[in-house]
């Protein structure tokens, strides 16, 4: 009598997540009488996948009718495959008895599940930083299989090199995640810059998945301040200008102080954007020189994006002022300045 063979013809089967997997199994003989069962894994911890006689296996269906007479095909189809279904599946023949006795197992079919990575999500720093500082961006993608994946970072199309990437877990798993951190040195020109995280995987039809972040969310460009005085008007009024240039974001409050007392406070709004994404703003203050007996200390105080205020100050000498002024005069452009205009 020829010994019964349990034939699993495929050593391995690959399937895409969401598809169905067919696991083939035939037996060479109808005897001895007894059921066929499918298991995932071997040994005492194996998991029952399908048993015709009992149990509820909603995702598993027999390929051919197992109740038909002389049936020797015990192939099964598992629907809606997920990465968690990966493993080695064994078709096992039992001899009928009380209880049934395991007689012979097939060689096993390894089911590998290919799953696409999720769209990469890029997150930037929690607080803004200024030019010359380094900020970190993180990119994450999950749920892919097999483990092999490539991740690249780009800033304005140029690949970044200061990158640290990890794929988890390190060992064998049903699916994997990737997390990468890129360190970017900011420049004043980065308001319109963009970082891109690009993920390539065997399941993607040639084009990598991309996640993006705008450096505008991460950068603060502090303003330059310049205070100038226009020509003296006939009515003894001096027009003083505070030019606030090249700042980002737009959130800015400007306060004029005369001899330390608040004269006027303004909030920047609806400013036109410069080509590089920064903003400029000009504020004017009319000072009636004849109303003052002593020199007037004028201060333009700018508070940008919640940062400590920056001041520009200068003094207007009230006595012996000429009626006409030939040229504009500017306060110096750094720190807190006092400058005699006359």
């Amino acid at each position: 009598e020829e010994e019964l063979q349990v034939i699993q013809p495929e050593k391995s089967v690959s399937v895409a997540a969401g598809d169905s997997a067919t696991l083939n199994c035939t037996v060479s003989s109808l005897i001895p009488v007894g059921p066929i069962q499918w298991f995932r894994g071997a040994g005492p911890g194996r998991e029952l996948i399908y048993n015709l006689k009992e149990g509820h296996f909603p995702r598993v269906t027999p390929v051919s009718d197992p109740t038909k007479r002389n049936n020797m095909d015990f192939s099964i189809r598992i629907s809606n495959i997920t990465p968690a279904d990966a493993g080695t599946y064994y078709c096992v023949k039992f001899r009928k008895g009380s209880p049934d006795v395991e007689l012979k197992s097939g060689a096993g079919t390894e089911l590998s599940v290919r799953a696409k990575p999720s769209a990469p999500v890029v997150s930037g720093p929690a607080v803004r930083a200024t030019a010359e500082h380094t900020v970190s961006f993180t990119c994450e993608s999950h749920g892919f299989s097999p483990r092999d994946i490539t991740l690249k970072w780009f800033k304005n199309g140029n690949e970044l090199s200061d990158v640290q990437t990890n794929v988890d877990p390190a060992g064998k798993s049903v699916s994997y995640s990737i997390r990468s951190t890129a360190r970017v040195v900011l420049t004043r020109r980065d308001v319109h810059s963009q970082v891109i995280c690009e993920v390539a995987h065997v399941t993607l039809q040639g084009d990598p998945l991309r996640g993006t972040a705008n450096l505008s969310e991460a950068i603060r460009v502090p303003p330059f301040l310049e205070v100038t005085q226009q020509s003296m008007r006939a009515d003894n009024q001096v027009n003083v200008t505070c030019q606030v240039t090249k700042f980002y974001p737009q959130r800015l409050q400007l306060t004029w102080l005369e001899n330390g007392n608040v004269s006027r406070t303004e909030m920047a709004s609806a400013l036109p954007e410069n080509k590089d994404g920064t903003y400029n703003w000009t504020s004017w203050l009319l000072v009636n020189v004849s109303a003052h007996r002593d020199d007037v200390k004028l201060t333009c105080q700018v508070e940008h994006d919640g940062q400590p205020a920056v001041n520009k100050s200068f003094s207007v000498k009230v006595s012996a002022h000429p009626k006409e002024q030939g040229s504009n005069t500017a306060a110096e452009n750094t720190g807190t300045n006092e400058r005699n205009i006359y």
Partner: antibody, heavy 116, light 109 residues
Framework: VQLVESGGRLVQPGTPLTLSCTVS????????MGWFRQAPGKGLEYIGI?????SPYYASWVNGRFTISKTSTTMDLKMNSLRSEDTATYFC?????????????WGPGTLVTVSS | DIVMTQTPSSVEAAVGGTVTIKCQAG??????LAWYQQKPGQRPKLLIY???TLESGVPSRFKGSGSGTDYTLTISDLESADAATYYC???????????FGGGTEVVVK
């Protein structure tokens, strides 16, 4: 699902030539497609692929001599300044549904002969 | 580019016999290896992908194995219809490029 190459013929060295691969039964916007060639009596050689969105990638030896492009139903291989060593049967192929690491559907090929 | 070294270049075996073809990659290709069969004047036909997964409709007499850099195609119970040239093809997931082995001609006596 079918692929058919066309455009192969006898040309003189230095002549440009464009081959086409016409597909049916699936959408070119869903799969990576590739071009390969096989010189008489020799093995298979990879030329390049075009991604589902239309981005081409080439073997390092191509050096800008060949250009791959596509429309909704055809993929083209534009060959500049052909040489005698470009004489080969040119195949187009589609990657498998599970990934880009293998090609499961191939066209019958079209013969390009470069000779004076 | 990855170089694929396929051996032997030619092999002869009798009907019912077994043939083993080896393919070695210049660096690890993480099981991204396919095997094709090509008969004279015909297009290549996919047999196996991902090192060991049998393409639908291909007889189970064709078996692929291997990992890392070394891969094997075994054809058992040889039939006269198996006479053909067999090619291995790699895909490298980092460079995303393809390479073929030089081919093995199988002659069935």
């Amino acid at each position: 699902v079918q692929l058919v190459e066309s455009g192969g013929r006898l040309v003189q060295p230095g002549t440009p030539l464009t081959l086409s691969c016409t597909v049916s039964g699936f959408s070119l916007s869903s799969y990576v497609m590739g071009w390969f060639r096989q010189a008489p009596g020799k093995g298979l050689e990879y030329i390049g692929i075009i991604s589902s969105s239309g981005s081409p990638y080439y073997a390092s030896w191509v050096n800008g001599r060949f250009t791959i492009s596509k429309t909704s139903t055809t993929m083209d291989l534009k060959m500049n300044s052909l040489r005698s060593e470009d004489t080969a049967t040119y195949f187009c192929a589609r990657v498998g549904p599970l990934g880009v690491d293998y090609f499961n559907i191939w066209g019958p090929g079209t013969l390009v002969t470069v000779s004076s | 580019d990855i170089v694929m070294t396929q051996t032997p270049s030619s092999v002869e075996a009798a009907v019912g016999g077994t043939v083993t073809i080896k393919c070695q990659a210049g660096q690890s290709i993480n099981s991204y290896l396919a095997w094709y069969q090509q008969k004279p004047g015909q297009r290549p036909k996919l047999l196996i992908y991902y090192a060991s997964t049998l393409e639908s409709g291909v007889p189970s007499r064709f078996k692929g194995s291997g990992s890392g850099t070394d891969y094997t195609l075994t054809i058992s119970d040889l039939e006269s219809a198996d006479a053909a040239t067999y090619y291995c093809q790699s895909w490298h997931y980092i460079s995303r490029s393809y390479a073929f082995g030089g081919g093995t001609e199988v002659v069935v006596k």
